[in-house]
């Protein structure tokens, strides 16, 4: 839990992971009834459409380019003069995908496992990417893992999911070290099925949870 109860809460809808050319709505919510807000990008390339602008509750951003990838914060206020801005919100990382070819995703021992059996998902590519990122049901999760060269000439990362409790559909992405929020196309989806249990949307070892999308590193 990040302190500062008067600070606004910045979030992305439907997801902070956005395909290139797609759109994302950024929402600045608050406990203080702010109705206007400003948005700024903390790192990387500036986004001109945000500069010195005031928004009402939300902003639709797009079509998204690699320049939109990065860390954002908002400040809230009430529409009066002179405007007094709140403390900055939590950081929100926007990731842009679709910038490289897709990696491959596979499961060990296989995509269908028994309840309690250990599952590992392997993401790999023939290109020399530095990092791999795992997503479940379209939601990105920690941790990201470094790519390790494999004997077959691919670059691979293994995500141990632990004992299987609930199934789900997974994809993975690759990225480069100097552009951590610019990702590849998603891998083909991999359905992991757990026999002897029904799927649930509650957090479990097979569904690492991350409430506000990507966290900063």
């Amino acid at each position: 839990h990040e302190g500062g109860q008067d600070k606004p809460l910045l979030s992305a809808w439907p997801s902070a992971v956005v395909p290139r050319g797609g759109h994302v709505t950024l929402l600045c919510r608050s406990r203080l009834g702010f109705t206007i807000f400003s948005l700024y990008k903390e790192d990387g390339v500036p986004v001109p459409e945000l500069y010195n602008k005031i928004f009402w509750k939300s902003i639709l951003m797009g079509p998204v380019t690699p320049a939109h990838a990065g860390t954002y914060r908002c400040r809230g206020s009430h529409p009066r003069s002179p405007i007094e801005w709140s403390a900055p919100s939590n950081p929100l990382v926007i990731v842009v995908t679709g910038l490289f070819g897709k990696p491959s995703l596979s499961a060990q021992p296989g995509p269908t496992v028994r309840t309690g059996e250990n599952v590992t998902l392997s993401c790999s590519s023939r290109s020399s990417f530095d990092m791999y990122h795992l997503s479940r049901e379209g939601r990105a999760h920690e941790p990201r893992l470094p790519a390790v060269p494999s004997v077959d000439g691919t670059f691979q990362a293994d995500f141990p999911l632990g004992p299987a409790t609930h199934g789900g559909t997974y994809t993975c992405f690759s990225s480069l070290h100097d552009s951590p929020y610019e990702w590849s196309d998603p891998s083909d989806p991999l359905l992991v099925s757990v026999t002897g249990n029904s799927s649930s949307s509650s957090s479990s070892p097979t569904e690492p949870s991350s409430k506000t999308g990507i966290r900063r590193h």
């Epitope: 302190g3 109860q5 008067d6 709505t25 406990r31």
Partner: antibody, heavy 116, light 107 residues
Amino acid sequence: QIQLVQSGPELKKPGETVKISCKASGYTFTDYSMHWVKQAPGKGLKWMGWINTETGGPTYADDFKGRFAFSLETSATTAYLQINNLKNEDTATYFCSRDVDLYFDYWGQGTTLTVS
Amino acid sequence: DIQMTQSPASLSASVGETVTITCRTSENIYSYLAWYQQKQGKSPQLLVYNAKTLVEGVPSRFSGSGSGTQFSVKINSLQPEDFGNYYCQHHYGIPFTFGGGTKLEIK
């Protein structure tokens, strides 16, 4: 484990004052804002407002401005709801609740106030 | 203020049946909707937040769905402990408002 424990039932006369307590345990009190919710007999839930547990700053819903006051005793990890000049329509159960991302994940057991 | 319209106001069902409770909001709240269950004489308990995320420990027969202005919670294969009152609440920002409630009774 996380708990919000409220003070016991109250029977008051119109015009009197009541102070209801909400003792929090099992988490860092100043990390989460505390909200108050009213439920009149046989009715639904009505949000009254919240108090910033870091600063003590209260925010009141429009219908609860004036006779209502939120306060804290941070050292005792306790939040308070005080209602002055009680009216018959204040008869209700009052809940404290903890806010995470603007929804309420833990609730007190409720304090029944009867004004008669 | 955002108005929350919950339906039906009351519902009778038998153990083993499937029921759906809906909540409509007066403006777009994206996915910022929570559902609570309240038993007689008890405090509300959080079931679902962000429209579809089930709270840990809540049985998987409960599921939330919807976005924008239309939301629902579905309970598959009703169990005796599922009967009580259900409320929706937007968590888009203050002032927070709750739906009028749905009373789920045993038929």
